[in-house]
Amino acid sequence: QLSLPSILPNENEKVVQLNSSFSLRCFGESEVSWQYPMSEEESSDVEIRNEENNSGLFVTVLEVSSASAAHTGLYTCYYNHTQTEENELEGRHIYIYVPDPDVAFVPLGMTDYLVIVEDDDSAIIPCRTTDPETPVTLHNSEGVVPASYDSRQGFNGTFTVGPYICEATVKGKKFQTIPFNVYALKATSELDLEMEALKTVYKSGETIVVTCAVFNNEVVDLQWTYPGEVKGKGITMLEEIKVPSIKLVYTLTVPEATVKDSGDYECAARQATREVKEMKKVTISVHEKGFIEIKPTFSQLEAVNLHEVKHFVVEVRAYPPPRISWLKNNLTLIENLTEITTDVEKIQEIRYRSKLKLIRAKEEDSGHYTIVAQNEDAVKSYTFELLTQVPSSILDLVDDHHGSTGGQTVRCTAEGTPLPDIEWMICKDIKKCNNETSWTILANNVSNIITEIHSRDRSTVEGRVTFAKVEETIAVRCLAKNLLGAENRELKLVAPTLRSELTVA
């Protein structure tokens, strides 16, 4: 940590005679520089030079050959490396007065006559006298304004908006400044910053637009940081809105975006008069071309129960916005002819949700359904098969006699989705068939009995059982069952001998 530089003469302030010369020496442990009242253009009679000495310190001398009123002001010696744009200069100061009977006030630039006040804050009207002994008064349209005066700074106080004049008398001669205009600006102790991006997803060739708005603050410096900044790709714009309240709208426009323009877009607002900072950021992505992604929330084979209400939801990510349509068996779904509806809702900027709704599922609703999403750059689809599940039911149960051989076949036709399984049961004691315990399942490996199953179509099945010889009356039961239910029917098989007796009778 370096100790502050030192100045010779070792005084806070010094009065220098008009047209005389003066010099100020600065000593430091590192390289030092001077800051002085005049601008570079005005300082032709100010000479700065480095001086060698054997103390081991760095010495820089400021010399004025002919002092004038304009040389009145603060001279600061500072270490080169400590100067930053944001901070007030840290160093050693001396204030020089150069009294001039013809110049009561230190000459100022035109911008110094505009005094910006933040709301009800205090401000300085910078009329500085060349002579510390000169009495000064401040006036506005209503007369003398009471305010504290410091010849190094000017009048300090809380001023209302309008023009102010400083007045001084030097050796009986009256001097007046031109009017200082006090202008009030809105400035809050906190920065209210909002970032707004209508879109965060773009494709090559489009124009990126991002805005940052600062509310109730007119004393703001706003900087943009974004991927194309080094190439100077962005166009910035500021618009001040006064109604319904003060708002500064900063717009960054990046035309002809490329993938390289993807990244973080940041605006950093800093209040020009206070160390108040606020930052906002948005991530922008630029795609080479448009895209579509389909993400179903169900599988490629789906089942629905008869009369059930079911929704099939598909998530879609797409840019530019997609057109979404549904097909059934490759034909456009005509909603008004069925109890099927579809809808699309936008969930986020590039996220959509499409729903296919079955109101009361019917057998004919089974089929292949396809969602198609398309925009000018891409087409994507997803197809799934839907099966309407129907409880099994027996359509027909009949027997078929094989003439004199005494063999008989029983056919059981059943339908349902999924395809029903068919089981056979027999009851040999016809008198006890009302009792469930009298029924036994017909096993496949029983001799003289053959069972077989044939699918007729996707939802109909036929089961057959063939008895090589029926010697006494038995009951046969066909049991058709699937996931949704079971149904059974029974049939009496009479032995051929008994049948012929019955025929004779």
Epitope: N216, K242, V243, P244, S245
Partner: antibody
């Protein structure tokens, strides 16, 4: 559907007071600036007052400053205008109106929706 | 305060006519100007904001133009429902001020 319904108008003597209300529905009331605008019989429109979303900022036309107070209750979706020290020249139909937004929300649309108005008559 | 001067104060026109109404501001208001339509006994209705942006739901026969101090509202083809009074309004600075109005009547 955006709806603004004013109430509270009526006949009042000079120097008297009146409180107008505006019930808002069909939009997020707390997200919008609101205004009162008046129209004297057979005359043009005159803006009266503005209030920010949270009520923290209020602006008035000079002729009503110190006499009228605009306020709002976001929980009740209601806008109010308290009118004191009423004068004959305050006789008018008073409308409540909303400020819309466009673009990315940075820009305002003045009075994009209006109520049907309520008549205030100041007369002795 | 900014004065808004509308002209003409009234005009007569027929259905199908092209009608232009002018509004002048006493000082520059950039494009912070709105136009409203009002029918007798009814509340005003927003037509145009930001000098030239059409409010949603307003027919495209209405258009606005201008910037600074001089603005116009144009009805390209007057319809029976367009017979009404029209007001301009500045919202550049407080107090917000309206023009005196233009009454469009049937010829």
């Amino acid at each position: 559907e955006v709806q603004l319904v004013e109430s509270g108008g009526g006949l009042v003597q000079p120097g008297g007071s009146l409180r107008l209300s505006c019930a808002a529905s069909g939009f997020t009331f707390s997200s919008y600036w609101m205004s009162w605008v008046r129209q004297a019989p057979g005359k043009g429109l005159e803006w009266v007052a503005n209030i920010k979303q949270d009520g923290s900022e209020k602006y008035y036309v000079d002729s009503v400053k110190g006499r009228f107070t605009i306020s709002r209750d976001n929980a009740k979706n209601s806008l109010y205008l308290q009118m004191n020290s009423l004068r004959a020249e305050d006789t008018a139909v008073y409308y409540c109106a909303r400020w819309g937004v466009f673009g990315s929300g940075s820009y305002y649309i003045p009075f994009d929706y209006w109520g049907q108005g309520t008549l205030v008559t100041v007369s002795s | 305060d900014i004065q808004m001067t509308q002209s003409p104060s009234s005009l007569s026109a027929s259905v199908g006519d092209r009608v232009t109404i002018t509004c002048r501001a006493s000082q520059g208001i950039r494009n912070y100007l709105a136009w409203f339509q009002q029918k007798p006994g009814k509340a005003p209705k927003s037509l145009i904001y930001a000098a030239s942006s059409l409010q949603s739901g307003v027919p495209s026969t209405f258009s606005g133009s201008g910037s600074g101090t001089h603005f116009t509202l144009t009805i390209s083809s007057l319809q029976p429902e367009d017979f009404a009074s029209y007001f301009c309004q500045q919202y550049e600075i407080y107090p917000l001020t309206f023009g005196g109005g233009t009454k469009v009547e049937i010829k």
